[in-house]
Interface confidence: low
Amino acid sequence: MEDEKPKVNPKLYMCVCEGLSCGNEDHCEGQQCFSSLSINDGFHVYQKGCFQVYEQGKMTCKTPPSPGQAVECCQGDWCNRNITAQLPTKGKSFPGTQNFHLE
């Protein structure tokens, strides 16, 4: 039986992290970075972070935007710094409040 090929360590990227899941950290390390926007009780909820597991990100990142949620993913150090996910419907957050979320 052929030996299984050794797993190559996946490339990890430094990502901007903003949101409750980040705690006190403003960055995280993962195989993909993301920027997401969802609607929660009518308010825009912005989050940024990383997917440690590529499959997890692959599933989420391929989900098409809906009127209530959008996720944009990228690979590269700090690649999500200037990405703001957009909902397909028209609407915007409070001026200047990109990347902030409702408690």
Epitope: E18, G19, L20, C22, G42, F43, H44, K90, K92, S93, F94, P95, G96, T97, F100, H101, L102, E103
Partner: antibody
């Protein structure tokens, strides 16, 4: 529920500097923009400016360079400084937390400017 | 700056009456409009965001409508606890501005 508690001097003389601080409780400091709003006696509401947890600010141009808003994330506090006050700055000053609307408000601080 | 003109500045109505307040923006604000209630001696309270969306816990007798530059706020059946001053506010651009307020009293 986010709670805001504010404090600062309530009586000032013309040309002095107004200084108010607002403490944020029960909330993630990165969740909101933090604004100051004032209301002269018997009048309407005026937005003074806003800041985020990274210190990015937007101020009302009507107050030119008199307004400074700062943040101390280690204490979950943000502050307002208004220089060269006059009687026209007499008002109740509120700190607020907002996303697309001013969701949470401090109790208000009545500031009187009088010689 | 975007000017928000509210009318009337004050009104008096009986309990159970339908009360309507209007708010006109000096330019199209893309429906980025909120309504607040302020009772005497208290801070304002956000009731409606984005023209017509009620915050959780706000009674259904309050409603909002309009688009573009012209908006209205309605209390379908005025109650004694609705005595307050009501403000509209836009967030289409900076600076953020409020209407001048409408004081509602019981006749």
């Amino acid at each position: 529920q986010v709670q805001l508690q504010q404090w600062g001097a309530g009586l000032l003389k013309p040309s002095e500097t107004l200084s108010l601080t607002c403490a944020v409780y029960n909330g993630s400091f990165s969740s909101f923009y933090w604004s100051w709003i004032r209301q002269p006696p018997g009048k309407g509401l005026e937005w003074l400016g806003e800041i985020n947890h990274r210190g990015r600010t937007n101020n009302n141009p009507s107050l030119a360079s008199r307004v400074t808003i700062s943040v101390d994330t280690s204490k979950s506090q943000f502050s307002l400084r208004l220089t060269s006050v006059t009687a026209a700055d007499t008002a109740t000053y509120y700190c607020t937390a907002h996303t697309r609307g001013f969701l949470y408000w401090g109790q208000g601080t009545r500031v009187t400017v009088s010689s | 700056d975007i000017q928000m003109t509210q009318s009337p500045s004050s009104l008096s109505a009986s309990v159970g009456d339908r009360v309507t307040i209007t708010c006109q923006a000096s330019q199209d604000i893309n429906n980025y409009l909120n309504w607040y209630q302020q009772k005497p001696g208290q801070a304002p309270n956000l009731l409606i965001y984005d023209v017509f969306n009620l915050l959780p816990g706000v009674p259904s007798r309050f409603s909002g409508s309009g688009s573009g530059t012209d908006f209205s706020f309605t209390i379908s059946s005025l109650q004694p606890e609705d005595i307050a001053t009501y403000y509209c506010q836009h967030y289409d651009d900076l600076p953020l501005t409020f209407g001048g307020g409408t004081t509602v009293a019981i006749r």
